[in-house]
Interface confidence: low
């Protein structure tokens, strides 16, 4: 649903010069932080495109929807939103495009109602494994998060730590089994080359998974079997060449699934036969009539649904002595 719109009548603004005047006093329950717009009726605070370098300390206790987008926060420390009294009603937190490069352990602690978190479009070079779980216990208290939006959080190549970016993100998703209740996970546009095999099995409540616009080449080692609630799986704009029988069977076995496969470089050779047969029969693939071959050259732009077994051949492998250089 769309966020409440800003209007002169419903939002109050705090002038920047008021900030120093109130900083020495405890915040008033309904006061609005400097550089922010607040609507108590909509339970919404917007601190958008203000180049803030830290989370305002004087957020009103009524806040349910908090937009901190387009700022320069850089680091989100432990307890970044911990307040006395706590922000007990904060349910939706949007931190997208705020130049965050480090999210530390426990950054979202003391937010008992936090259901939606959007960290998209931040170059997260250092995402603590305990960013979402808050502790390093093997089993943490369950997080209230239902939606986690992590689109385009990959940092530039020269800012990455000497470790797998996929591994760093997955470690944060799985730590302490805190995200067992997660229903929507978006990981689009992150240059993922692979999906660690254990990640989906440990997120059993997922309804929506968006992996679009990555660089996934294969799903061979990814199991969807446990995701019995999965309703949408977005795999558009990856580097998928073919889906093999095991994956096809698992997807077909999910009762509510809709799969999106557009704009992948499908290789239409003999290995594609099972997938073509499945596509002709299945109803789980949205827009399946748009899927076309990318390779080999002679098959380019052919529609997968229009292929038959005679079209799907593999060139014989020549013995070394007959191969040309």
């Amino acid at each position: 649903s769309s966020s409440p719109t800003s209007s002169a009548s419903s939002f109050s603004s705090s002038a920047p010069f008021l900030a120093s005047a109130v900083s020495a006093q405890p915040p008033l329950p309904d006061q609005c932080p400097a550089l922010c717009e607040c609507s108590e009726a909509a339970r919404t605070v917007k601190c958008v495109n203000r180049n803030l370098t830290e989370v305002p300390t004087d957020l009103p206790a009524y806040v349910r929807n908090l937009f901190l987008t387009g700022n320069q926060l850089a680091v989100l420390p432990a307890g970044a939103f911990a307040r006395r009294p706590p922000l007990a009603e904060l349910a939706a937190l949007n931190l997208s495009g705020s130049r965050l490069d480090e999210v530390r352990a426990g950054a979202f602690e003391h937010l008992p109602s936090l259901r939606q978190l959007d960290l998209s479009h931040n170059p997260l070079a250092d995402l603590s494994p305990f960013a979402f779980s808050g502790s390093n216990a093997s089993v943490s208290a369950p997080s209230p998060l239902v939606e986690l939006i992590l689109n385009h959080i990959v940092p530039p190549e020269d800012e990455r730590q000497n470790r797998s970016f996929e591994g760093m993100v997955v470690a944060a998703l799985l730590a302490g089994r805190a995200l067992q209740g997660l229903r929507r996970l978006e990981l689009a546009s992150n240059h993922f080359l692979y999906l660690p095999r254990d990640v989906l099995a440990q997120l059993p409540s997922l309804r929506h998974l968006d992996l679009s616009n990555n660089s996934l080449v294969s799903l061979t080692y990814v199991s969807f079997r446990n995701l019995t609630h999965l309703e949408s799986l977005h795999l558009e704009d990856n580097a998928l060449k073919v889906l093999h029988n095991g994956t096809l069977a698992e997807l077909q076995g999910l009762p509510h699934i809709r799969v999106f496969l557009d704009n992948n470089p499908w290789v239409c050779d003999c290995h594609m036969a099972d997938m073509v047969t499945w596509l002709k029969e299945t109803e789980v693939v949205q827009g399946k009539d748009r899927l076309t071959c990318a390779y080999p050259e002679k098959m380019r732009n052919r529609v997968l649904l229009e292929l038959n077994s005679a079209d799907l051949d593999c060139d014989p492998i020549l013995p070394p002595s007959l191969q040309t250089s």
Epitope: S2, D118, I149, N151, E186, A188, D210, S212, S232, H234, E236, R258, F260, D262, E283, Q286, G287
Partner: nanobody
């Protein structure tokens, strides 16, 4: 602007029937699978049924199989849910849903819902 408007709800006795409609506008209705989802008082949203673009395939939650029928008329941009043998546990607000795109917040559209009450 995408709009989904449900109608046809009301009060019905157990064992009775209702037909819900969802009028769609603002997008190419025939290009997208559609679903019905319901939310009973104090409970979470529950998927009820889905139908593919041309209506060639339908799927149902176990709780409504054999009693509910989802259909669509692409010429009229309308989605339907025929509900027979209604039970008290079918009481809920019924929403139609169109997931129109791969991304985002804003690509998953819902109507305002229509209330179905099954009671004697």
């Amino acid at each position: 602007e995408v709009q989904l408007v449900e109608s046809g709800g009301g009060l019905v006795q157990p064992g009775g029937s209702l037909r819900l409609s969802c009028a769609a506008s603002g997008f190419t209705f025939s290009s997208y699978a559609m679903s019905w989802v319901r939310q009973a008082p104090g409970k979470e949203r529950e998927w009820v049924a889905s139908i593919t673009t041309a209506g060639g395939s339908t799927r149902y939650a176990d709780s409504v199989k054999g009693r509910f029928t989802i259909s669509r008329d692409n010429a009229k941009n309308t989605l339907y849910l025929q509900m027979n043998s209604l039970r008290a546990e079918d009481t809920a607000v019924y929403y139609c849903n169109a997931e129109l795109g791969p991304r985002r917040l804003g690509m998953d559209y819902w109507g305002q819902g229509t209330l179905v009450t099954v009671s004697s």
